[in-house]
């Protein structure tokens, strides 16, 4: 039960006080008690419940009321059952007794009022009055947890605006309101109560730039909403009529959780006594609601795809045809960024990552815009953000970034359990160097901090700086599976490729050619690849790098060897000993449900079939997956990327609610 104020009573004159329903009010009967008195009794109106703690009754009065010793250890508390119809209509009488003096009476006139700030603390999508039931001042995780949730209003419901909805002080329409969380102030007071009292709604100064609160006028259009709290206004005096009244507020978050902001915002209503104009206003009562800002959540390859993105560039029509066919098979919407908008930047995966935010009443896809800012710089903000599609970015917008700040270097695992700890939304994966050095690359700290601060997909740092491009999607992917953990981790594997090529040579296919059918590309015989000592050394190094990640992933995702599939792949070390795929990198695939768009490797054709394609199909088809090999050689592969790098996917949010987990 909420804490009320302390009321001191004195026999000299009647005391007038306000008691808020649902609060426990302390009654100080000792400090002003007559000197010779040693005990007391209390009588109260039916609407007042008196509770006296400590010690048995000293003596029973004939009237049936008990007397208690006048002792500082005796605690007297009051609660009120109903709101007052008029000021001071509830009475408490204290009678003091002494051995030689007649009883002395002290009178207390109470006004019972109902004041409660309600939000959806039960996370049902509805605001229910919770007076005296739950402590709204704490926010707890888990299925039995409580506490309200706020969305960052980061979409753009007004198509004529270039800004996010949370960047203005206006409520556009009912669409805009739906992105906000409802909070209701319920009051029930005597008619004249607010002539001597005031209500003020406020937020801590440290949180005022993270939230905006609009006050709605009931029964009027949403355009009647006016801002009452926000970056410029930490407090607001409310004009409340007496009697029974409800006031609606709509709350939007302005910032995602981050290093300097844990994501919690407390809104407080304070009741002030303004009856004495000579004195400052006195606080009578406070009620608070704590909100947590919904985190940005990534979706793994195992979530159903809803929309595919790709770029149209010079001569990639065939690639786009393949992606279109795949999207149709997976029943996905397809969005193509035209040449004039991508400015010859085809790397859709690197520019953005599409996740979502969720409150009990609303789920919103949100695009996380990387700071790489090349030709596709404007695409997320101009073409992706919109009505019910949010936007967030982090990191320096001009310079100070590396290749590891592109979002091919940002992936998320499917849900996992690791040594008994559940990650029901999976874990974020990104690449880093294995140790810092003068020229090593790492994901910008601002990005790392943002990802960690979301709390619900605890990040795992992998080692990717050994790659020329340096992205985790160059050596790993996840595909759905019908058994075990519901997925398989795919890892690029030079060892597996050498084993396959050796088997083919042993069967007399040493003359079979890699890159056959590719114009202007020097073809390589299996036997020459197997006999090239330098290439072997390069791939031995690559294997060690991937194996390091393999063990890291097994440990941090709780995987067994049987959860991992090795995809045959060779690499070569180029300048500064950075690795690039020797032939199109098959692990860099587009996963659309059971439909996989895999870079066509142009491997040695044996008995009319590419042995690399055949091997990959034999590994993946038993899982119910359909492999489509896409020719990306000249349009993507030779430009240091593949199918996954050149595409992006919006996926269905998890059915699991993030607030039900315990980070």
């Amino acid at each position: 039960m909420a804490q009320g104020t302390l009321i001191r009573v004195t026999p000299e004159q009647p005391t007038h006080a306000v008691c808020v329903l649902g609060t426990l009010t302390q009654l100080d009967i000792c400090s002003s008690a007559p000197e010779d008195c040693t005990s007391f009794s209390i009588n109260a109106s039916p609407g007042v419940v008196v509770d006296i703690a400590h010690g048995p009754p000293a003596k029973k009065k004939s009237t049936g009321s008990s007397t208690w010793p006048l002792d500082p250890g005796v605690e007297v508390t009051l609660t009120m059952k109903v709101a007052s119809g008029s000021t001071g209509d509830q009475k408490v009488q204290i009678s003091y007794y002494g051995p030689k003096t007649p009883p002395v009476k002290a009178l207390l006139y109470l006004t019972g009022v109902e004041i409660s700030l309600c939000a959806d603390i039960t996370r049902t999508g509805k605001v229910k009055p919770t007076r005296a039931v739950k402590d709204q001042r704490t926010w707890t995780w888990g299925p039995c947890g409580q506490g309200a949730i706020l969305l960052v209003n980061c979409d753009r419901d007004n198509l004529e605006s270039s800004a996010m909805d949370c960047e203005d002080d206006e409520v556009l329409d009912s669409e805009d309101l739906q992105d906000m969380s409802l909070m209701t102030l319920s009051t029930k007071t005597p008619k004249d109560f607010f002539t001597n009292h005031t209500l003020v709604l406020h937020v801590a100064r440290s949180e005022m730039d993270k939230v905006r609160v609009f006050q709605a006028t009931r029964g009027k259009l949403s355009s009647k909403c006016s801002v009452v709290l926000g970056p410029k206004w930490p407090s607001h005096y409310l004009m409340v009529p007496g009697g029974k009244h409800n006031m609606d507020f709509y709350v939007e978050a302005l910032a995602f959780p981050d290093t300097d902001f844990p994501g919690l915002i407390t809104l407080t209503i304070s009741l002030l006594d303004t009856s004495n104009l000579e004195l400052p206003e006195a606080v009578v009562f406070q009620d608070s609601v704590v909100f947590r800002v919904a985190p940005w959540i990534m979706t793994p390859n195992t979530q159903p795809p809803q929309e595919v993105y790709a770029c149209s560039i010079f001569e990639n029509e065939d690639f786009l045809k393949s992606v279109t066919t795949l999207a149709m098979k997976a029943k996905c919407k397809l969005t193509i960024c035209p040449e004039e908008e991508n400015m010859d930047d085809q790397w859709m995966q690197d520019e953005m990552e599409i996740g979502y935010i969720q409150a009990p009443h609303k789920t919103l896809p949100v695009v996380f815009d990387s700071p790489r800012n090349r030709g596709l710089k404007e695409f997320p903000i101009k073409r992706v953000m919109g009505p019910d599609f949010g936007y967030v970015t982090r990191g320096p917008q001009t310079g100070g970034i590396s290749g590891l700040d592109s979002f091919g270097n940002l992936e998320v695992s499917p849900p996992v359990t690791v040594r008994g700890k559940e990650y029901p939304l999976g874990r974020i994966l990104f690449g880093d160097s294995c140790y810092p050095s003068n020229d090593s690359r790492q994901m910008h700290q601002a990005l790392q901090d943002f990802l960690s601060a979301q709390q619900v997909q605890a990040p795992v740092k992998l080692y990717s700086d050994w790659l020329s491009v340096g992205h985790v999607d160059e050596f790993l992917s996840f595909v759905p599976a019908p058994d075990r953990k519901g997925f398989r981790l795919l890892l690029a594997s030079p060892r597996s490729c050498y084993k396959l090529f050796q088997e083919q040579q042993n069967e007399g296919h040493g003359e079979a050619l890699l890159f056959e059918g590719i114009k202007k590309k020097k073809q390589q015989k299996i036997k020459n690849i197997l006999s090239n000592k330098t290439l072997r050394e390069h791939n031995s190094f690559v294997e060690r790098c991937i194996d390091w990640n393999r063990e890291l992933l097994k440990r941090e995702l709780g995987l067994a060897e049987s959860d991992i599939i090795d995809i045959p792949q060779l690499f070569k070390l180029k300048e500064f000993s950075k690795a690039e795929a020797f032939f199109p990198n098959m692990v860099n695939m587009l996963v659309l449900g059971k439909h996989l768009g895999i870079p066509k490797p142009f491997g040695p054709v044996i008995n009319g079939r590419c042995c690399l394609e055949e091997k990959v199909c034999s590994l993946l088809e038993p899982l119910g997956l359909q492999c489509t090999f896409i020719n990306d050689f000249f349009t993507y592969h030779i430009r240091h990327g593949e199918v996954h790098c050149g595409t992006n996917v919006r996926r269905k949010p998890f059915s699991f609610k993030w607030w039900n987990m315990v980070p």
């Epitope: 050095s437 491009v469 020097k522 290439l535 070569k572 180029k574 500064f576 950075k578 240091h640």
Partner: antibody, heavy 128, light 111 residues
Framework: QVQLVESGGGLVKPGGSLRLSCAAS????????VSWIRQAPGKGLEWVSF????????YYADSVRGRFTISRDNAKNTVYLQMNSLRAEDTAVYYC?????????????????????WGRGTLVTVSS | QSALTQPRSVSGSPGQSVTISCTGT?????????VSWYQQHPGKAPKLIIY???ERPSGVPDRFSGSKSGNTASLTISGLQAEDEADYYC???????????FGGGTKLTVL
């Protein structure tokens, strides 16, 4: 073959900044590694910085690390060298050089470590 | 103080051969086959004449040849001609924190 032209040099006070540009013609610069090399008056060559063709990693000499930034805009066929906190000892002719990344060997040779195409250079003078 | 050591000057008569040495360490010349040589005439930009220790770009006469032994690389110019008079610089990839090193340069005089 690609031709390179440097620009942006000039006189600057110590502590000041300059941005050098290296514009390419005759070929697409996105197929090339690019390095900046400088030569102080009457002195030898000093390697300054490198950016790979994929625009995914960079390297710097100890003498400029933290002050200079190499970047590229493949759409503009240009590589840049942003020079901040300039010192008198940065006075030199700055050359832009490149090597083609389009290699067909099983194992690519070290084309990032040598410079087969050079621009004519641009003079940077740091003096108060 | 250059990281790779070259003689300040060498000279030879037309038709003769000269060799310019370039000494590094186990962390650069000794470790990598990424040694290159450049010719620079006064007031001009350098020109690549040898890469990967001994390979010649197209258009460079076969009078120019490169080799390496241990931590020392060498450039040999046979059948010296007047137009060979120039400064010559060696360069190597390095394990050090500056990944490409140059020598201090050698002035070749054709007598």
């Amino acid at each position: 073959q690609v031709q390179l032209v440097e620009s942006g040099g000039g006189l600057v006070k110590p502590g000041g900044s300059l941005r050098l540009s290296c514009a390419a013609s005759g070929s697409t610069l996105s197929d090339y590694f690019v390095s900046w090399i400088r030569q102080a008056p009457g002195k030898g060559l000093e390697w300054v910085s490198f950016i790979n063709a994929a625009n995914t990693f960079t390297y710097y000499a100890d003498s400029v690390r933290g002050r200079f930034t190499i970047s590229r805009d493949n759409a503009k066929n240009t590589v840049y060298l942003q020079m901040n906190s300039l010192r008198a000892e940065d006075t030199a002719v700055y050359y832009c050089s490149s090597a083609n990344d389009d290699v067909d060997d099983i194992v690519a040779p070290g084309r990032g470590y040598y410079m087969d195409v050079w621009g004519r250079g641009t003079l940077v003078t740091v003096s108060s | 103080q250059s990281a790779l050591t070259q003689p300040r000057s060498v000279s030879g008569s037309p038709g003769q051969s000269v060799t310019i040495s370039c000494t590094g360490t186990r962390g650069d010349v000794g470790r990598y086959n990424h040694v290159s040589w450049y010719q620079q005439h006064p007031g001009k930009a350098p020109k690549l004449i040898i890469y990967n220790v001994y390979e010649r770009p197209s258009g460079v006469p076969d009078r120019f040849s490169g080799s390496k032994s241990g931590n020392t690389a060498s450039l040999t110019i046979s059948g010296l001609q007047a137009e060979d008079e120039a400064d010559y610089y060696c360069s190597s990839h390095s394990r050090s924190s500056t990944p490409v090193l140059f020598g201090g340069g050698t002035k070749l005089t054709v007598l």
